[in-house]
Amino acid sequence: RTTTCFGDGCQNTASRCKNGGTWDGLKCQCPNLYYGELCEEVVSSIDIGPPETISAQMELTVTVTSVKFTEELKNHSSQEFQEFKQTFTEQMNIVYSGIPEYVGVNITKLRLGSVVVEHDVLLRTKYTPEYKTVLDNATEVVKEKITKVTTQQIMINDICSDMMCFNTTGTQVQNITVTQYDPEEDCRKMAKEYGDYFVVEYRDQKPYCISPCEPGFSVSKNCNLGKCQMSLSGPQCLCVTTETHWYSGETCNQGTQKSLVYGHHHHHH
């Protein structure tokens, strides 16, 4: 598509947008990885901002003995199910009250025997690089606490003195799922064909996906007076020419005084 706009060299700009850029009638709209008038430059930093929180879900089964099973409990919209859910949730909130990562419980199924409760325990923690350890520890505490309560709160002479009583042998942990967050993998994927040159560095426990062209990090490439530019073969320094000097070298650190060249002398500094 050809679009006419105003300004020098503006004819056919639409067809000149590079790297998948699209012309919006005024300028090239660049995909995430690119910027510049024609989307010709590769960004030096990609936002892989981690989720604010990471979640885990534990699939548990406990057997409640202080409630007798009735068919209505199978129906999640019944008054029986709603009352059971209320008591069970209150009981579990007490059981797990000392776990900062605990969010709540979600009953998935109630079945006969006395009342077998299939449910999820939901955990959440603020993202830090150590989130996996935090959630692993929390799941261990959940196991300890549910084992303890289902051992202690039991029926005596067919009577329960607690909010709920349990069958000690009916407690099982079926599965534990932790939301996976891998900043290195995300960084590589989002950098696409430049993935080999982008790395993750942490600042204030937040991951940054950067190329060596991004200043201020330990991997940053110092191009001195030059400009760092990313290409498929890696980051390169584009050296500048000033009124008095040419700059060259891997990091544009070699300055040649123009007047000396014209006088057939080289002077490096």
Epitope: V67, T70, Q86, S161, M163
Partner: nanobody, 123 residues
Framework: EVQLQASGGGVVQPGGSLRLSCAAS????????WGWFRQAPGKEREAVAL???????FYADSVKGRFTISQDNSKNTLYLQMNSLRAEDTAVYYC?????????????????WGQGTMVTVSS
């Protein structure tokens, strides 16, 4: 939603009798569990007598042989017949209900409560 209205309290001499009633509105009276709890000044609420739709009943040791729990499904009413009353029976009496078939004495497991009716046993 179950609504409960307790009545029948009063002042009675030791050895006397009272019958408490608890009228229920709603269509759930024939299922679940029903009970009488009491709370004496400065003490926790405790289960006195409980009954479930499967025929199970419970009486606190302190009232066994003296109190009787019953229900009239046609009138949607729960009763507590209290005989041989003692000074230590003085308390506010509450009726409670749940659509669940419960086997627990803990008040926290009971979802619906009537307002209390005062029973004073004094000479």
């Amino acid at each position: 939603e179950v609504q409960l209205q307790a009545s029948g309290g009063g002042v009675v001499q030791p050895g006397g009798s009272l019958r408490l009633s608890c009228a229920a509105s709603g269509d759930t009276f024939s299922r679940g569990s029903w009970g009488w709890f009491r709370q004496a000044p400065g003490k926790e609420r405790e289960a006195v007598a409980l009954i479930s739709s499967d025929g199970w009943t419970f009486y606190a040791d302190s009232v066994k042989g003296r109190f009787t729990i019953s229900q009239d499904n046609s009138k949607n009413t729960l009763y507590l017949q209290m005989n041989s009353l003692r000074a230590e029976d003085t308390a506010v009496y509450y009726c409670a209900a749940s659509v669940l078939v419960l086997r627990t004495l803990n008040p926290k497991a009971w979802h619906h409560w009537g307002q209390g009716t005062m029973v004073t046993v004094s000479s």
